[in-house]
């Protein structure tokens, strides 16, 4: 039986300042039950970038239709990129629980920010 995989197809993405960055992520299964979250960095100091149910993330939107059934595309788009957004972004699957438990992470996508073209 195949285990759930979290796939981030791009190792790196380069975006000009002021533009939008798309960070791709897909899962191979709808189970185990639990959410996908996006983080920048690893370890206890990592920054939560997107959680569909908790928090306010005005610059981040899911790429897929939010009413799409049985969605396995967890890609996000970050608008108005600045140099401060540079870093490695991870798409992370959690198993539902109290609290949710981290189950599997994608390999990460490094976002680099180019100077805005003059």
């Amino acid at each position: 039986e195949e285990e759930l995989q979290v796939i981030q197809p791009e190792k790196s993405v380069s975006v000009a300042a002021g533009e939008s960055a798309t960070l791709n992520c897909t899962a191979t299964s709808l189970i185990p039950v639990g959410p996908i979250q996006w983080f920048r960095g690893v370890g206890p100091g990592r920054e939560l970038i997107y959680h569909q149910k908790e928090g306010h993330f005005p610059r981040v939107t899911p790429v897929s239709d939010p009413t799409k059934r049985n969605n396995m595309d967890f890609s996000i788009r970050i608008s108005n990129i600045t140099p401060a957004d540079a870093g490695t972004y991870y798409c992370v699957k959690f198993r539902k629980g109290s609290p949710d438990v981290e189950l599997k992470s994608g390999a990460g996508t490094e976002l680099s920010v180019r100077a805005k073209p003059s």
């Epitope: 709808l30 059934r69 049985n70």
Partner: antibody
């Protein structure tokens, strides 16, 4: 066409055991969560249990007495019911979970149900 | 546990009338509400998910609305085959999944 067919219901004495089965077809069983929902005679719907991969979830009313399991090679869902009580009397429905957005499960296909009667 | 309260418990309606069913949650569930129809002796059937999205094959006369704690299922013009019991369900915070007590729509 998605089909869910329950079996294994019947009459059992209080304290007894029963094992329900649900044969699934028409969808990729192994990648979906599946659930049991019951309905006591003349009453509303009550969620019983859900299984994802090896992750399982139970209503407090059945925790420790019921065990949900699945066999993906047979496309079959099970509910082992032990220490049965009169209040477990109900039609038990097998239901396929569906998600919307990035999380959140509801039930998009249901079986026809199997009646479990707990009575002495 | 999130409690869903449906009202009214019973509704007597004539075919062709507009029907409005209410479901109130004890706390914010965003738009994580589904509606089901159940006819006597049958399994429930999914009508609406995500508060307002119709399931495949569900007639356009069924519509859902609301967010937060107050939700509505509307049948714009009741047909004879629409009689039965309607349940709402929340999936915002589980376990447990919870259902409302149901609204019975019967012939006047």
């Amino acid at each position: 066409e998605v089909q869910l067919v329950e079996s294994g219901g019947g009459v059992v004495q209080p304290g007894g055991s029963l094992r329900l089965s649900c044969a699934a077809s028409g969808f990729s069983f192994s990648i979906y969560a599946v659930s049991w929902v019951r309905q006591a005679p003349g009453k509303g719907l009550e969620w019983v249990s859900t299984i994802g991969a090896d992750d399982t979830y139970y209503a407090d009313s059945v925790k420790g007495r019921f065990t949900i399991s699945r066999d993906n090679s047979k496309n079959t869902l099970y509910l082992q019911m032990n220490s049965l009580r009169a209040e477990d009397t109900a039609v038990y429905y097998c239901a396929k979970d569906s998600t919307v957005g990035w999380s959140g499960d509801f039930f998009d296909y249901w079986g026809q149900g199997t009646l479990v009667t707990v009575s002495s | 546990e999130i409690v869903l309260t449906q009202s009214p418990a019973t509704l007597s309606v004539s075919p062709g009338e507009r029907v409005t069913l209410s479901c109130r949650a004890s706390q914010n569930v965003r738009s994580d509400i589904a509606w089901y129809q159940q006819k006597p002796g049958q399994a429930p059937r999914l009508l609406i998910y995500a508060a307002s999205s119709r399931d495949t094959g569900i007639p356009a006369r069924f519509s859902g609305s609301g967010s937060g704690t107050d939700f509505t299922l509307t049948i714009s013009s009741l047909q004879s085959e629409d009689f039965g019991v309607y349940y709402c369900q929340q999936y915002y915070d589980w376990p447990p999944f919870t259902f409302g007590g149901g609204t019975k729509v019967e012939i006047k």
